[in-house]
């Protein structure tokens, strides 16, 4: 909400699935920036008022995080500088399924991409030779 004259940057997500009770990954990459302090990562979810996760100025900023995700999210802080904004989601729940948005701001501009996340009790198929 608000106005910015910066250019858009490319943000890429991959649809994924998470196993209930286990940890999951929501994948997101972006055009990297040379300064970590200039990078802002925000994860949002449709149907949720607060943020899923926010990372800015080189650290997590959790004051705007929705209580539904409290204590369950993390980014790979050491990989942000190379353009990895993927989110680790701990203890995946059925209600975590839905549409997420990975929103990125850097000194080059801003961009976002949606991701469909499915949850369930998945198992690896057995292959008999």
């Amino acid at each position: 909400f608000g106005i910015s004259g910066r250019h858009s940057i490319t943000v890429t997500t991959v649809a994924s699935a998470g196993n209930i009770g286990e940890d999951g990954i929501l994948s997101c990459t972006f055009e990297p920036d040379i300064k970590l302090s200039d990078i802002v990562i925000q994860w949002l979810k449709e149907g949720v008022l607060g943020l899923v996760h926010e990372f800015k100025e080189g650290k997590d900023e959790l004051s705007e995080q929705d209580e539904m995700f409290r204590g369950r999210t993390a980014v790979f802080a050491d990989q942000v500088i190379v353009g990895n904004a993927s989110l680790r989601l701990k203890n995946v729940q059925l209600t975590d399924a839905g549409t997420y948005k990975c929103y990125i701001i850097t000194s080059k501009g801003k961009g976002n991409a949606n991701l469909e996340y499915k949850t369930g009790a998945f198992s690896m198929p057995e292959v008999n030779v």
Epitope: F1, G2, I3, R6, L49, S63, Q65, G71, Y103
Partner: antibody, heavy 115, light 113 residues
């Protein structure tokens, strides 16, 4: 610097509706919730509800459920709060505020409900 | 809903003296995993919107004078103004942002004695 500018004062009749707008400018984020907080004359602050402008997700306080509708238009960076079935007790200053932590506030809109 | 109760309702303090406002929540707003209290303090002057002073119970918002400090944990919190200035005359509110609905205390009116 983020600025929230609200629409002007309104005088309404009991039973009618009012729609207050809140236009955001100067910020780079379109991701924080826009909340609505009201303050009756000489009274405290009361959270009415909020919206995530990017997805249009709205949440309301139980007290206002069914009477309030919060919407947002991303293209104009404007949030709206509509309150229906107005009664005299709804006379108050209505504020929009950005974020769960209300770091930025609109200037307030006085809504007077009187017959 | 979490109920926030402030005390006193009003307070008169001499210029240069210490002012203390208390806030109690009906349930804990401390999240033990990150050891953070989801408690904020706001200042509201007549005819103006509230202004955020303190969040995480004790972190001053940028630009807020260091005479303002916050303390407490769990359910009991305090806002302290170490040396009251004339411009500090206002109503002060605590707010919990631990859970939705966000709730505020009823406010404490601070005046000069």
């Amino acid at each position: 610097q983020v600025q929230l500018v609200q629409s002007g004062a309104e005088v309404k009749k009991p039973g009618s509706s009012v729609k207050v707008s809140c236009k955001a400018s100067g910020g780079t984020f379109s991701t924080y919730a826009i909340n609505w907080v009201r303050q009756a004359p000489g009274q405290g602050l009361e959270w009415m509800g909020g919206i995530n402008p990017m997805f249009g997700t709205a949440r309301y306080a139980q007290k206002f459920q069914g009477r309030v509708t919060i919407t947002a238009d991303e293209s104009t960076s404007t949030a709206y709060m509509e309150l229906s079935s107005l009664r005299s007790e709804d006379t108050a200053v209505y504020y929009c505020a950005r974020g769960r932590l209300h770091r930025h506030w609109g200037q307030g809109t006085l809504v007077t409900v009187s017959s | 809903d979490i109920v926030m109760t402030q005390s006193p309702d009003s307070l008169a303090v001499s210029l240069g003296e210490r002012a203390t406002i208390n806030c109690k929540s009906s349930q804990s707003v401390l999240y033990s995993s990150n050891n953070k209290n989801y408690l904020a303090w706001y200042q509201q002057k007549p005819g103006q919107p509230p202004k955020l002073l303190i969040y995480w119970a004790s972190t001053r918002e940028s630009g807020v004078p260091d005479r303002f400090s916050g303390s407490g944990s769990g359910t009991d919190f305090t806002l302290t103004i170490s040396s009251l200035q004339a411009e500090d005359v206002a109503v002060y509110y605590c707010q919990q942002y631990y859970t939705t609905p966000i709730t505020f205390g009823q406010g404490t009116r601070l005046e000069i004695k």
